[in-house]
Interface confidence: medium
């Protein structure tokens, strides 16, 4: 069987791109819980392509961060806290 | 999306003042820097200075400190370039630029003659 | 100030063939591993357009026939194989730290 790397849990971790000797810039990475169910009925009623299994998911996110400026002259966010929350961001 | 929308053409007489607009959507100002750019005809590109939005720290090319005034307001997300004294030398496309790597966006210029 | 200075000024490079324009720093522009500098495109009546940012990292659309190379001081843009699209002027920008300056720009004509 292929090996299965286990997916970290959502923690704050370094990101090397935008961190500096001694000013890490940490950013919220790892993963959280999924799950899926059946459809409900009165949910299905409402779906334009109706599917059959329902996927419920959530992302790894900043409870708490706040803006700093790297060098190259901008501000990213240095988060201070994560959790598993709404996903804000998906890739078309 | 992501767009700043300026102000349009502007005729000056010698030694007045104008007040350029920059109005972003898209994006709140707060969350980065906005730039300015001059660009004379026929000529490159020149830095004139930033803001920070969030606190209204300013940082200028030494050669725009006294000629030009960048201020923002938030309320309505709208960056601003202030220009006295006017002179010929001041004939140019003056851009608003959010400046981030992988998200970089330009106004579309404003003419001032 | 990082000065930046541009070669050549004005470049004619035949359809399919390779554009090369220099860029140098007047003092290193690199720090932490990384190299702060920016390739911009401008055609006539356009604002500039991020091609290159951090001396190698192609911007989000930006065809995969530019590239950008360099560190310390010595920076290139290179474009291959030229097309007929890619006729404007090519200004590099360091932004290591205030005040951000621009090269002179390179023209770069198709024939």
């Known amino acids: 069987a292929p090996d299965v790397q286990d997916c970290p849990e959502c923690t704050l971790q370094e990101n090397p791109f935008f961190s500096q000797p001694g000013a890490p810039i940490l950013q919220c990475m790892g993963c959280c819980f999924s799950r899926a169910y059946p459809t409900p009925l009165r949910s299905k009623k409402t779906m334009l392509v109706q599917k059959n299994v329902t996927s419920e998911s959530t992302c790894c996110v900043a409870k708490s961060y706040n803006r700093v400026t790297v060098m190259g002259g901008f501000k990213v966010e240095n988060h201070t806290a994560c959790h598993c929350s709404t996903c804000y961001y998906h890739k078309s | 999306q992501v767009q700043l929308q300026q102000s349009g053409a502007e005729l000056m007489k010698p030694g007045a003042s104008v007040k350029l607009t920059a109005s972003c959507s898209g994006f709140?100002?707060?969350?980065?820097?906005m730039h300015w750019v001059k660009q004379r005809p026929e000529q490159g590109l020149e830095w004139i200075g930033r803001?920070?939005?969030?606190?209204?720290?300013?940082k200028y090319d030494p050669k725009f400190q006294g000629k030009a005034t960048i201020t923002a307001d938030t309320s309505s997300n709208t960056a601003y370039l202030q220009l006295s004294s006017l002179t010929s030398e001041d004939t140019a496309v003056y851009y608003c630029?959010?400046?981030?790597?992988?998200?970089?966006?330009w106004g579309q210029g404003t003419t001032v003659t | 100030d990082i000065q930046g200075t541009q070669s050549p000024a004005s470049l004619v490079v035949s359809l399919g063939q390779r554009a090369t324009i220099s860029c140098r720093a007047s003092k290193s522009v690199s720090a932490s591993g990384y190299s702060y500098v920016n390739w911009y495109q401008q055609k006539p009546g356009q604002p500039p357009k991020l091609l290159i940012y951090?001396?190698?990292n192609l911007e989000s659309g930006v065809p995969a026939r530019f590239s950008g190379s360099g560190s310390g001081t010595d920076f290139t843009l290179n474009i291959h194989p030229v097309e007929e699209e890619d006729a404007a002027t090519y200004y590099c920008?360091?932004?290591?730290?205030?005040?951000?300056?621009f090269g002179a720009g390179t023209k770069l004509e198709i024939s």
């Open positions: 630029h959010r400046f981030e790597f992988a998200m970089d966006y």
């Open positions: 709140s100002i707060k969350d980065t820097y």
């Open positions: 920008q360091h932004s290591r730290e205030l005040p951000l300056t």
């Open positions: 803001i920070d939005p969030a606190n209204g720290n300013t």
């Open positions: 951090l001396a190698s």
